[in-house]
């Protein structure tokens, strides 16, 4: 009929949702497209219209709200599974139109199958405990409005398979999990299963997430360079192929950027004419702090680029550092022949 | 609604192996633990053990092992339960029961297996 | 495995009375405790869940409390259709064991 403001598919907002269980799923518009909400959208007299596209189909079709138990329904800019089954999978689209208004936008919907330990193909958000760092709780999440204040659910929470019970360090408190000393011995997928009552009839809520130990920033320090150093002299002759790594340890820091970079007489090496390449490998340690090595390479290096100033720096949220390489030339080793000659007097 | 049925009261010969099933609709079969759960006549509740049909994972009591086998046919939605080398003592209400956890909230409504000579 | 002790094993209360039954484990079960409901002849029905969780449809004359070892089931104003057998269940620790059962009559 008459044009739509159409935003297409929100691929950003994958939302995966386990199979048997309620989700609530609010339409995009209102949270990422438009600059007004619901409310305001439905007292200017504008209706708010679900639709879908089955997984492998083309045809879009009218979600049916006439299900047995309203398994699923809307309230306001809420559509509500409940529960949901795996052939709900597929495209969602909310429509809000009048006779002179309409925008419109789709996102994806996967209804995912969990094994007996719950496994399962869903992404799960990380969580980054601070290593021996005192208590630090986790918060079963994306559990907000699917049952009143008044409800007092019951929350179980597993590390992988098993039930937390008894952990000498990791405390169940409801919904939060206290981690009373965080160790590398904690990392693994927490699942929190919220069960509720409603109408009659019970549900659950089961959320999984990762628990990541990392280091704390109470041991973290500026980075270190550990190469190139005072103890190592780079000599090479020219037309010889001169390789100088600069190794440096970052501490983990929450949200900090490393970097790491060559300057040759002052200038990055894209700034300066001399055919230089730049390597860079990076490694982590069991709580996230970072090594990172950048091999400097000249193929063929001249008697110019020997007498030059190598210097690597390195910064992160806690500093910036930098260390010059020893480099210099070989000086060559005496002719044997013409020592020897010269040594019995020849002329 | 949770409905799950079970077969009807067998009698048996010592020796002999029971098969129970029980069929399960009202929810998504795949996504809960399946319970067995006997009863000898006047007697209190024993669990057997439990199988997630999603993936096959089972959990068997020390009591029952080796002689106890639960299955689950997903396309039927039905779970078994096969007790072998059965004896007098064996005799008793044998119930399925579901637990999306480890509760059992749902339970069929009983199969009497006679085990007598 | 965990020994669960039930008391007492029956009770004759009249219709409106405050009834208890206790359950014991033989050692910590960190509040994973079910009470079911048996009705003569039929199959058990679950009626609380993790100590004090309301199954869905259960009337709120029962509750559930406890911790540790102690747990209890309350039927704050007995009814007539309460008349039952009443187990309790432990599932902290595999495989789950009942209680030998609470026979509730009617006096």
């Known amino acids: 009929s008459e044009r739509c403001d159409d935003w297409g598919l929100d691929t950003m907002r994958q939302i995966q949702v386990f199979e048997d269980e309620p989700a609530r799923i609010k339409c995009p518009l209102f949270e990422h497209f438009l600059k007004f909400n619901y409310s305001t959208a439905h007292s200017a007299g504008l209706t708010l219209i679900w639709y879908w596209t089955r997984q492998d189909r083309d045809l879009e079709e009218p979600i049916n709200f006439r299900l047995p138990e309203n398994r699923i329904s809307k309230e306001k800019d809420v559509l509500w599974f409940r529960p949901t089954l795996l052939n709900d999978t597929g495209n969602y689209t909310c429509m809000l139109r009048n006779t002179t208004y309409c925008s419109k936008v789709a996102f994806p919907l996967e209804v995912v199958q969990k094994d007996s330990c719950f496994n399962s193909p869903m992404k799960l958000p990380v969580h980054k405990l601070y290593i021996e760092y005192g208590i630090q709780r986790i918060t079963c999440p994306n559990v907000d409005g699917y049952f009143p204040s008044s409800v007092k659910p019951t929350i179980t929470w597993y590390m992988g398979c098993y039930k937390i019970q008894n952990f000498n360090n990791v405390i169940p408190e409801g919904m939060n999990l206290s981690f009373l000393i965080a160790l590398i011995s904690n990392n693994g997928n927490y699942t929190c299963v919220v069960t509720y009552p409603e109408n009659g009839r019970t549900f659950h809520l089961t959320r999984t997430l990762t628990v990541k130990v990392v280091g704390s920033p109470k041991n973290a320090v500026p980075p270190v360079i550990h190469s190139p150093n005072d103890h190592v002299v780079y000599e090479k002759e020219p037309g010889e192929e001169l390789l100088i790594p600069c190794t440096v340890y970052f501490s983990f820091l929450m949200d900090s950027r490393n970097e790491v970079w060559w300057t040759i007489d002052g200038k990055k090496p894209d700034d300066i004419t001399i055919d230089v390449t730049i390597n860079e490998s990076i490694s982590h340690s069991r709580t996230e702090d970072e090594t990172r090595t950048q091999i400097l390479s000249i193929k063929k290096v001249t008697s110019e680029d020997l007498k030059r100033s190598y210097v690597c720096h390195a910064r992160s949220a806690k500093g910036e550092v930098a260390k010059a390489a020893k480099v210099k030339q070989k000086v060559p080793a005496p002719r044997y022949t013409v020592e020897l000659a010269c040594g019995f007097g020849a002329t | 609604q949770v409905q799950l049925v079970q077969s009807g009261a067998e009698v048996k010969k010592p020796g002999s192996s029971v098969k129970v099933s029980c069929k399960a609709s009202?929810?998504?079969?795949?996504?809960?633990?399946m319970n067995w759960v006997r009863q000898a006549p006047g007697k209190g509740l024993e669990w057997m053990g439990r199988?997630?049909?999603?993936?096959?994972?089972?959990h068997y009591a020390q009591k029952f092992q080796g002689r106890v086998t639960l299955t689950a046919d997903k396309s039927t939605s039905t779970a078994y339960m096969e007790l072998s080398s059965l004896r007098s003592e064996d005799t008793a209400v044998y119930y399925c029961?579901?637990?999306?956890?480890?509760?059992?909230?749902?339970w069929g409504q009983g199969t009497l297996v006679t085990v007598s000579s | 495995d965990i020994q669960m002790t039930q008391s007492p094993s029956s009770l004759s209360a009249s219709v409106g009375d405050r009834v208890t039954i206790t359950c014991s484990a033989s050692?910590?079960?960190?509040?994973?405790l079910n009470w079911y409901q048996q009705k003569p002849g039929k199959a058990p029905k679950l009626l609380i869940h993790?100590?004090?969780g309301l199954h869905a449809g259960v009337p709120s004359r029962f509750s559930g409390s406890g911790s540790g070892t102690d747990y209890t089931l309350t039927i704050s104003s007995l009814q007539p259709e309460d008349v039952a057998t009443y187990y309790c269940?432990?599932?902290?620790?595999?495989?789950?064991?009942f209680g030998g059962g609470t026979k509730v009559e009617i006096k």
């Open positions: 269940q432990q599932y902290s620790i595999l495989p789950w064991t």
């Open positions: 199988i997630y049909p999603g993936d096959g994972q089972t």
């Open positions: 029961g579901e637990g999306y956890l480890d509760p059992m909230d749902y």
């Open positions: 993790y100590t004090s």
């Open positions: 050692q910590g079960i960190n509040n994973y």
């Open positions: 009202g929810y998504t079969f795949t996504s809960s633990w």
